[in-house]
């Protein structure tokens, strides 16, 4: 199971990196286009990965003004990078009953980023609890 647990660790590192990136972007909310974006909240169990992909697909945009433009766009690019695959992620990809991205309430960038962080924290918590209980599924 060594390679499996290494994959899990890579996944955890990536999710924590994503939280850092979200926190970084929150510093620049005034430099983001004030567009309303689908922002999943209170995501039902087993739909976390579906909601995660909604956050990644959202068209978060820099206002392209001032000297923060490059930092913001690099951070947005980092947010969209695919995380290492996990068994739970693979399983959830086959689930067809999760809400579509458009069905989620739309929020401005500040709340969008807060909700994204909240989902990432939930996914990390689930991941840790599943490992504590001896499962390597999530």
């Amino acid at each position: 199971h060594k390679s499996s647990s290494q994959g899990q660790d890579r996944h955890m590192i990536r999710m924590r990196q994503l939280i850092d990136i979200v926190d970084q972007l929150k510093n620049y909310v005034n430099d983001l286009v004030p567009e309303f974006l689908p922002a999943p909240e209170d995501v039902e169990t087993n739909c976390e990965w579906s909601a995660f992909s909604c956050f990644q697909k959202a068209q978060l945009k820099s206002a392209n003004t001032g000297n923060n433009e490059r930092i913001i766009n690099v951070s947005i690019k980092k947010l969209k990078r695919k995380p290492p695959s996990t068994n739970a992620g693979r399983r959830q990809k086959h689930r067809l009953t999760c809400p579509s991205c458009d069905s989620y309430e739309k929020k401005p960038p500040k709340e969008f980023l807060e909700r994204f962080k909240s989902l990432l924290q939930k996914m990390i918590h689930q991941h840790l609890s599943s490992r504590t209980h001896g499962s390597e599924d999530s």
Partner: antibody, heavy 119, light 111 residues
């Protein structure tokens, strides 16, 4: 393995034009931010131009020294990056490197192609 | 434009001894805890290779005798024990904003 291979360099007279190409492989080119960086003989590195990914709508950016004369472009279907250089000056003489800007820093570089502008 | 000034412009080091290169920016390249400064080594006849990104992060595959530090306007690249293969020109580069600029380079040679 990531590979970037430049071509199109050569000798050109002042005022002339040249088109550089860069063939990319080993990574998802359409997602990449690509840049040209040049190095005059015996000198340091100078950033020339950048083109971002399809997801960013391919915006382009230029150093002041080449603005209005050089055009960076890409063809994602061919995994290729280009630099069209017009109104060339002697000070444009340099090795031109094709590079991938991967989040923080130029991670991958080609071997470079030499452009000589001389009469 | 942010101007990067490297010192010294050249240094000669005995193998096994440490080396240090400084890079000073004309304005801060740090913001909200991140420092947008990177270091490269260009070996003779080769393109540059990334050594350190975001001031202190070692690029994958780079020996851990290389380290970076600093924030704001002052940055340092250190080599704990110089080896023969470390010869070449070292450049700092910022990505705080466009245009991206490089330092003028520091040539390292072996005594």
């Amino acid at each position: 393995e990531v590979q970037l291979v430049e071509s199109g360099g050569g000798l050109v007279q002042p005022g002339g034009s040249l088109r550089l190409s860069c063939a990319a492989s080993g990574f998802t080119f359409s997602d990449a931010w690509m840049d040209w960086v040049r190095q005059a003989p015996g000198k340091g590195l100078e950033w020339v131009a950048e083109i971002r990914s399809e997801a960013d709508n391919h915006p382009t950016y230029y150093a002041e020294s080449v603005k209005g004369r050089f055009t960076i472009s890409r063809d994602d279907s061919k995994n290729s990056l280009y630099l069209q250089m017009n109104s060339l000056k002697t000070e444009d003489t340099a090795v031109y490197y094709c590079t991938e800007y991967d989040y923080e820093g130029f991670v991958h570089w080609g071997q470079g192609t030499l452009v000589t502008v001389s009469s | 434009d942010i101007v990067l000034t490297q010192t010294p412009l050249s240094l000669s080091v005995t193998p096994g001894q440490p080396a240090s290169i400084s890079c000073r920016a004309s304005k801060s390249v740090s913001t909200y805890g991140y420092s947008y400064m990177h270091w490269y080594l260009q070996k003779p006849g080769q393109p540059p290779q990334l050594l350190i990104y975001l001031a202190s992060n070692l690029e994958s595959g780079v020996p851990d005798r290389f380290s970076g530090s600093g924030s704001g306007t002052d940055f340092t690249l250190k080599i704990s024990r110089v080896e023969a293969e470390d010869v070449g020109v070292y450049y700092c580069q910022h990505s705080r904003e466009l245009p991206l600029t490089f330092g003028q380079g520091t040539k390292l040679e072996i005594k």
